[in-house]
């Protein structure tokens, strides 16, 4: 699947829009809001039911080139006594992001979009039971 | 920028770094997986910490829809389906990498653009402040 | 069987105002939590903004926090809402929500439409 064109027809294409070869597309990888920081609730991967460890992929042919995951420490979740409940289960939670791959062919360079799934942390969730007849 | 191993029967001209602007190929590699989360999995309603997703559609950004959650309690889902407000349900954050039309409505001229998106909802034991 | 009733929906313009009020059956001073949770359209009931029993007020995200405000009339029995700078994404069925002795109660709700 391609990049969906504009389909609306008060997007028509402005005089301004930088000359492109076929196939491809002009990507600045300087990002927008790059500075933002994420403000979430003090270590939730901790203090969660269902907590999680993080790890950090690095791949210099990426951008970017650190990518981190979430593992859930458990299969099942953590009970008000602090002790694994098997009853319930502790499941990834994920979100897609892309990512810019180059790729050497040679001495020349190519650069393509890539779709990665990222793990973020877990939930805990009743486990889906199926009865055999 | 990044730096990267270069091959050493290159000319020494090649930037190390990721250039500020690259041309990149339409087509996604493994633009395939499941963008909509309703359908990759029920978490959201069968967790303790249950969420809503809400459609969140930009035409000028790709991809053009994303999905945000919303918890739907405050405190968390317990054995006898009530809310336990000794438990908080949060939302679960994630800095994304999308594009950005730009110039504004040109079909082939991006710029990355990081969002901040709730993926989900996790149930954590709140933090006490106690006062002296 | 404790009951909540839901006034003060209606149809109203962008950046307009309305005030929901709940009427409680019991005592909202006994209550483990009292506040509001809407529906959107095709979506589940979520929490907006909660007062739990130590009197602590809770708003859902943001969005909601500084053009909502919840409150609590201990003597009348009553919860309200005060809405302010609706927006089309307000649109949803408004519920009253209360909790005593470990279990939630909801009422029927209140149809609150945002036109642009």
């Known amino acids: 699947r391609k990049i969906p064109k504009v389909g609306h027809t008060f997007f028509q294409k402005p005089e301004s829009c930088p000359p492109v070869p076929g196939g491809s597309m002009k990507l600045d990888i300087g990002i927008i809001n790059e500075n933002q920081r994420v403000s979430m609730s003090r270590n939730i991967e901790s203090r969660s039911t269902s907590p999680w460890n993080y790890t950090v992929t690095w791949d210099p042919n990426r951008y970017p080139s650190e990518v981190v995951q979430a593992q859930c420490r458990n299969l099942g979740c953590i009970n008000a006594q602090g002790k694994e409940d098997i009853s319930m289960n502790s499941v990834p939670i994920q979100q897609e992001t892309l990512v810019v791959r180059r790729k050497h062919q040679g001495c020349s360079v190519s650069f393509q979009l890539e779709k990665v799934l990222v793990t973020v942390g877990c939930t805990c969730v009743t486990p889906v039971i199926h009865h055999v007849q | 920028g990044i730096t990267i191993p270069r091959n050493p029967g290159c000319p020494n001209s090649e930037d190390k770094n990721f250039p500020r602007t690259v041309m990149v190929n339409l087509n996604i590699h493994n633009r395939n997986t499941n963008t909509n989360p309703k359908r990759s999995s029920d978490y959201y309603n069968r967790s303790t910490s249950p969420w809503n997703l809400h459609r969140n559609e930009d035409p000028e950004r790709y991809p053009s829809v994303i999905w945000e959650a919303k918890c739907r309690h405050l405190g968390c889902i317990n054995a006898d389906g009530n809310v336990d407000y000794h438990m908080n349900s949060v939302p679960i954050q994630q800095e994304i990498l999308v594009l950005r039309r730009e110039p504004p409505h040109c079909p082939n001229s991006f710029r990355l653009e990081k969002i901040l998106v709730s993926v989900g909802c996790t149930c954590v034991t709140p933090i006490v402040h106690h006062v002296a | 069987e404790v009951q909540l009733v839901e006034s003060g929906g209606g149809l109203v313009q962008a950046g307009g105002s309305l005030r929901l009020s709940c009427a409680a059956s019991?005592?909202?001073?006994?209550?483990?939590?009292v506040g509001w949770y809407r529906q959107p359209p095709g979506l589940q009931r979520e929490w907006v903004a909660i007062?739990?029993?130590?009197?602590?007020?809770?708003y859902a995200d943001s969005s909601v926090k500084g053009r909502f405000t919840v409150s609590v009339d201990k003597v009348k029995n009553t919860v309200t809402l005060q809405m302010n700078s609706l927006k089309p994404e307000d649109t949803a069925v408004y519920y009253c929500?209360?909790?005593?002795?470990?279990?939630?109660?909801w009422g029927q709700g209140t149809q609150v439409t945002v036109s642009s």
């Open positions: 929500y209360a909790q005593w002795m470990g279990r939630d109660y």
């Open positions: 019991d005592s909202v001073f006994t209550a483990k939590a």
């Open positions: 007062i739990t029993s130590g009197g602590k007020t809770n």
